[in-house]
């Protein structure tokens, strides 16, 4: 039960996770401009990865797309194509992870199956989620060397009279929103490897005891009949009866006439 | 189309509050836009006083703040606006406006005239 | 505050000429995010409030004759009348639309010779 709610959980976190990702990833406001002294402003400027917004007080909204590959600085392009991978990487881990999920039953997709399947979304949620925290994290960079070098130079006269305030930037909420989706994507990456160990057969069920018993060399190896069909470690052996009640995380994923409804 | 029409007495004394309201018409106040009062002393030139935003945040000129309330009544489709311890510095004619694009005035009172005098 | 100069205060000119009018700020009006101009241009004739001519220093209000038009980015900034018509005798007034609080220039009389 405890394997299934893990599991499910990090499923849950790490679709959460992706979806704050994309969020973010499409979101307008990834640098703000900088108010300072002035939390009032007659034009307020934005940009987001895609494209630059100004908002006017008057109410207008304007936004215009960066409409060039070749203009755009390397550093902005790396933070999209991070963002990109940890989209991707993360849809692909939900596609995966959902046919991983021990609650859903497909065929008869044995539970070393499900587990490699739950390891390989669990692996694939912590590079999404690693992907979206770098990505954030090297423009977040980007905006704090921007944002020291226009205050080093933030008036610049001209023949003393006139002066040109230089726009300065400072971190959005999509920042925000990325940091805190990478870091739910990681989390429930980590909980799908997690559940993953539980998911796996171990390699058998009982451990070999021997008995020296006098006269006779004989190694006794205790669970009889089960012990011998190999049943923990072997699951492509018959079916055998057994009457004893097992928890959800202990049944094996059997065909049955249940399993194709 | 909006319309704004200004109104109050032409005449203040000293010291005391003068008080317009600027009724608009043709449109809601609640449109999202921001409401604004201009001046015009006699032969000079514009003075932007404020604006007031529906939901009843505001901003003051500097120049003004400490004297200048704007506020609003949306039920009445109006804002008004207070100026306290006038003097002859603030006869004017005074215009109520909606912005518009680029931060610009598209639409204006006609404006009313108001005396500071004993 | 952003100060606003009109130059000159007035301006006589023969009807059918080029009127220039400039106008200075004390601070740039250009905003890079859109890489727009932020002055706007108002004509005011006579006991009527000022008339909205061009906004985003070069963009005509709709029903402005195209004879007006704004022109420059930064500090100077300038409206132009291409042929000038009886009616466009006024005072013309620039306005910081870039940063509060909003203010104006002195006003530039336009008159005809």
């Known amino acids: 039960m405890a394997v299934t709610a893990c599991q499910g959980l990090g499923f849950v976190v790490s679709l959460i996770g992706i979806a704050g990702i994309i969020a973010a990833t499409c979101m307008d406001q990834w640098s703000t401009q900088d108010l300072y002294n002035n939390p009032v402003t007659a034009v307020f400027n934005y940009q987001g990865l895609w494209r630059s917004c100004v908002r006017e007080s008057s109410g207008f909204t304007e936004c215009r797309g960066y409409f060039t590959l070749l203009g755009l600085p390397a550093m902005l392009q790396a933070v999209r194509a991070l963002m990109i991978v940890g989209i991707v990487l993360g849809a692909i881990g939900l596609l995966v992870s959902i046919f991983a999920l021990k609650c859903i039953r497909i065929g008869s997709m044995e539970d070393s199956a499900k587990a490699n399947m739950t390891l390989t979304s669990g692996i694939m949620f912590i590079v999404s989620g690693l992907c979206a925290i770098a990505g954030v994290s090297v423009f977040a960079n980007m905006l704090v060397t921007n944002f020291w070098m226009s205050t080093a130079n933030m008036y610049t006269g001209m023949g003393g009279m006139v002066q040109t305030v230089q726009t300065r930037y400072t971190f959005g909420a999509a920042l925000f929103v990325g940091w805190v989706a990478g870091g739910l994507t990681l989390i429930g990456g980590v909980m799908m490897c997690i559940a993953c160990r539980g998911l796996a057969p171990e390699e058998t069920n009982y451990k070999a005891v021997s008995y020296h018993a006098s006269g006779h060399s004989v190694a006794y190896k205790p669970g009889g009949f089960k012990a011998s069909t190999g049943f923990g470690s072997n699951t492509k052996n018959k079916k055998i009866y057994d009457g004893g009640a097992r928890t959800e995380d202990e049944v094996q994923s059997y065909p049955s006439k249940h399993d194709y409804v | 189309q909006v319309q704004l029409q200004e109104s109050g007495p032409g005449l203040v004394k000293p010291s005391q509050t003068l008080s317009l309201t600027c009724t608009v018409s043709g449109g809601s106040i609640s449109s999202g836009y921001n409401w604004h009062w201009i001046r015009q002393p006699p032969g000079k030139g514009l003075e932007w006083i404020g604006y007031i935003h529906y939901t009843g945040s505001t901003n003051y000129n500097p120049a003004l703040r400490s004297r200048v309330t704007i506020s609003v009544d949306t039920s009445k489709n109006q804002f008004s606006l207070k100026l306290s311890s006038v003097t002859a510095a603030d006869t004017a004619v005074y215009y109520c406006a909606r912005i518009y694009n680029g931060n610009s005035f598209p639409y204006w009172g006609q404006g009313t005239t108001v005396t500071v005098s004993s | 505050d952003i100060v606003m100069t009109q130059s000159p205060d007035s301006l006589a000119y023969s009807l059918g000429e080029r009127a220039t009018i400039n106008c200075k700020s004390s601070?740039?009006?250009?905003?890079?995010?859109?890489?727009?101009?932020?002055l706007t241009w108002y004509q005011q004739k006579p006991g009527q409030p000022p008339k909205l001519l061009i906004y985003?220093?070069?963009t005509r209000e709709s029903g402005v004759p195209d004879r007006f038009s704004g022109s420059g980015s930064g500090t100077d900034i300038f409206i132009t009348i291409s042929s000038l018509q009886a009616e466009d005798v006024a005072v013309y007034y620039c306005q910081n639309a870039y940063s509060f609080p909003y203010t104006f220039g002195g006003g530039t009389k336009l008159e005809i010779k």
């Open positions: 985003w220093a070069s």
């Open positions: 601070q740039s009006l250009f905003n890079s995010g859109n890489q727009k101009n932020y």
